[in-house]
């Protein structure tokens, strides 16, 4: 994970608190899930590597009418508030596999927890 702070520069990275807040929101979503999350909507899976936050946003934004993940979408926007320039991290739009939103959230949560435990905030 080379640039948590978006794509403007590889400079400052999000403080651990911001990462923790995002983790807590994802935990809330998974714990409060009763019916299929977002009616079982499918989203593109992403590479959990550089540019992960913006990639996650670009994938989840395609889910409409699902209030359960709107806060997550807005929090992900905190990491990359301005659009990625064409050509930057082209992997953002590599689209080969679709998974359910619920699985996407679980995968993202597991990865973020791992990063948090390892202190990998940059």
């Amino acid at each position: 994970l080379t640039c948590l702070g978006g794509f403007a520069s590889p400079g400052p990275v999000p403080p651990s608190t911001a990462l923790r807040e995002l983790i807590e929101e994802l935990v809330n979503i998974t714990q409060n899930q009763k019916a299929p999350l977002c009616n079982g909507s499918m989203v593109w899976s992403i590479n959990l590597t550089a540019g992960m936050y913006c990639a996650a946003l670009e994938s989840l934004i395609n889910v409409s009418g699902c209030s359960a993940i709107e806060k997550t979408q807005r929090m992900l926007s905190g990491f990359c508030p301005h659009k990625v320039s064409a050509g930057q991290f082209s992997s953002l739009h590599v689209r080969d596999t679709k998974i359910e939103v619920a699985q996407f959230v679980k995968d993202l949560l597991l990865h973020l927890k791992k990063l948090f435990r390892e202190g990998q905030f940059n």
């Epitope: 702070g5 978006g6 403007a8 670009e58 807005r74 905190g78 659009k83």
Partner: antibody, heavy 118, light 111 residues
Framework: EVKLVESGGGLVKPGGSLKLSCAAS????????MSWVRQTPEKRLEWVAS???????YYPDSVKGRFTISRDNARNILYLQMSSLRSEDTAMYYC????????????WGQGTTVTVSS | DIVLTQSPASLAVSLGQRATISCKAS??????????MHWYQQKPGQSPKLLIY???NLESGIPARFSGSGSRTDFTLTINPVEADDVATYYC?????????FGGGTKLEIK
């Protein structure tokens, strides 16, 4: 309730400097990007600067190199350091919570007035 | 820079009638099928307030009388029916390309 309170505006001579502050409350400040947007005397709105939750900054060419946006996540304060001020920088400056390019400027403060005049 | 042209500059509408405001962009503001166009309301003496994001999504707490439509370069904000409290200036804003830009505003008055 989300609250954004700007301060630091005033009258400054061309070429001078000024530092604006914005105290945020009612949301997890550290988790959101923030921006400054100004409104000219002619009521035109102009985006001035943005900062991500991680501290990456974004500026239009009109202020790049003259203005610096920063944040103090411990105190929930957003700043705008303005230097080499010009008459065209005269405006009402608003602090806004930026929910990203997909959601726009979700919350705005009441603004602080900056007048650049000799 | 993307130029946003709003029309009309001002309009007067009777209470209970429909108000339609147009915003035209000098180039497309769509990103992978999502229109990065937002609408704000600014009442006299107040700061702007987000009404609509991504062309047609109603921000939380905004009455359903407000609606947005459009894609690529042509966008519309509709208020139906208009109420006295809607007297304000309305602005469109694009976030598809830096620098982010706003339209010149449309002032809504009651006839």
């Amino acid at each position: 309730e989300v609250k954004l309170v700007e301060s630091g505006g005033g009258l400054v001579k061309p070429g001078g400097s000024l530092k604006l502050s914005c105290a945020a409350s009612g949301f997890t400040f550290i988790s959101y990007a923030m921006s400054w947007v100004r409104q000219t005397p002619e009521k035109r709105l102009e985006w001035v600067a943005s900062i991500s939750s991680g501290g990456n900054t974004y500026y239009p060419d009109s202020v790049k190199g003259r203005f610096t946006i920063s944040r103090d996540n411990a105190r929930n304060i957003l700043y705008l350091q303005m230097s080499s001020l010009r008459s065209e920088d005269t405006a009402m400056y608003y602090c806004a919570r930026l929910d990203g390019y997909y959601f726009g400027f979700a919350y705005w403060g009441q603004g602080t007035t900056v007048t650049v005049s000799s | 820079d993307i130029v946003l042209t709003q029309s009309p500059a001002s309009l007067a509408v009777s209470l209970g009638q429909r108000a339609t405001i147009s915003c035209k962009a000098s180039e497309s503001v769509d990103n992978y099928g999502k229109s990065l166009m937002h609408w704000y309301q600014q009442k006299p003496g107040q700061s702007p307030k987000l009404l609509i994001y991504r062309a047609s999504n109603l921000e939380s707490g905004i009455p359903a009388r407000f609606s947005g439509s459009g894609s690529r370069t042509d966008f519309t904000l509709t208020i139906n029916p208009v109420e006295a409290d809607d007297v304000a200036t309305y602005y469109c804003q694009q976030s598809n390309e830096d620098p982010w830009t706003f339209g010149g505003g449309t002032k809504l008055e009651i006839k």
